[in-house]
């Protein structure tokens, strides 16, 4: 049993390492944003025993603009973008509590000269300009507006071979 893709969170990204049951993943606030105090960036693939369907828990994450970065200028296109903020530890505990976000929750603050990727604020959040469309078989499994109305898309890399190893179960590319 595996989970479908998790829900989208405004101003945040997530790189899913595993869709397996009980996998835990973390959303990362976009550069220039930070986790709002008291919200959680964590999600876990859990089983609804009544329906025997796996789903991701809903993160309470709210990514808010980082005031420290509001007045910084966009970087020139050639600037190397890197991050310099240590993420706060979070845990999925039975109580659902985690440390308050007193600082950015993730490595999402770019170096001073590269706080904002050029053009990233000029287009709708997460709006792709290229790539092929992937129709997800789980597109309507949760019914959240971000999942059912957003155009799904993908960018795939091609190369000489695929090394052996884990690949998210039940989720294959269409190339």
């Amino acid at each position: 049993i595996t989970c479908p893709p998790p829900m989208s969170v405004e101003h945040a990204d997530i790189w899913v390492k595993s869709y397996s049951l009980y996998s835990r993943e973390r959303y990362i606030c976009n550069s220039g944003f930070k986790r709002k105090a008291g919200t959680s960036s964590l999600t876990e693939c859990v089983l609804n025993k009544a329906t025997n369907v796996a789903h991701w828990t809903t993160p309470s994450l709210k990514c808010i603009r980082d005031p420290a970065l509001v007045h910084q200028r966009p970087a020139p296109p050639s600037t190397v973008t890197t991050a310099g903020v240590t993420p706060q530890p979070e845990s999925l505990s039975p109580s659902g509590k985690e440390p308050a976000a007193s600082s950015p929750s993730s490595n999402n603050t770019a170096a001073t000269t590269a706080a904002i990727v050029p053009g990233s604020q000029l287009m709708p959040s997460k709006s792709p300009s290229t790539g092929t469309t992937e129709i997800s078989s789980h597109e309507s499994s949760h019914g959240t507006p971000s999942q059912t109305t957003a155009k799904n898309w993908e960018l795939t890399a091609s190369a000489s071979h695929q090394p052996p190893g884990v690949y998210p179960q039940g989720h294959s590319d269409t190339t």
């Epitope: 829900m7 790189w15 976009n30 999402n108 904002i116 959040s125 799904n152 960018l155 890399a157 989720h171």
Partner: nanobody, 122 residues
Framework: EVQLVESGGGLVQPGGSLRLSCVGS????????VGWYRQTPGKQREWVAV???????DYAGSVKGRFTISRDNAKNTVYLQMNSLKPEDTAVYYC????????????????WGQGTQVTVSS
């Protein structure tokens, strides 16, 4: 479709540094989320780090504080700066231009480059 070429691997002593490069060709690489993975013989591929289009990053616990991922969109390149290397960092390192299944939701593509070997040994 994006093609990837990794480079920069080599033999380094424990405590040393290396910088790996992942050059992407094809449309869309600059707006891709790009991840680094590593694999040792007989073991499963292990996620190391990711950088998203906004520049935000995330790291595996085993490399946090030692590795830094960055990108230069003008050069269509993503870097992995590896400091304070340990023998257990020895592996073939691969980069991956992720698949986006929902806005802001990414996973590894099934297509991989040839990788670059990193060996940490005295």
């Amino acid at each position: 479709e994006v093609q990837l070429v990794e480079s920069g691997g080599g033999l380094v002593q424990p405590g040393g540094s290396l910088r790996l490069s992942c050059v992407g060709s094809g449309d869309g690489f600059s707006i891709s989320a790009v991840g680094w993975y590593r694999q040792t013989p007989g073991k499963q591929r292990e996620w190391v780090a990711v950088i998203f289009a906004s520049g935000s990053t995330d790291y595996a616990g085993s490399v946090k504080g030692r590795f830094t991922i960055s990108r230069d969109n003008a050069k269509n390149t993503v870097y992995l700066q590896m400091n304070s290397l340990k023998p257990e960092d020895t592996a073939v390192y691969y980069c991956n231009a992720g698949v986006t299944t929902n806005p802001g939701v990414h996973r590894a593509s099934r297509h991989w480059g040839q990788g670059t070997q990193v060996t940490v040994s005295s």
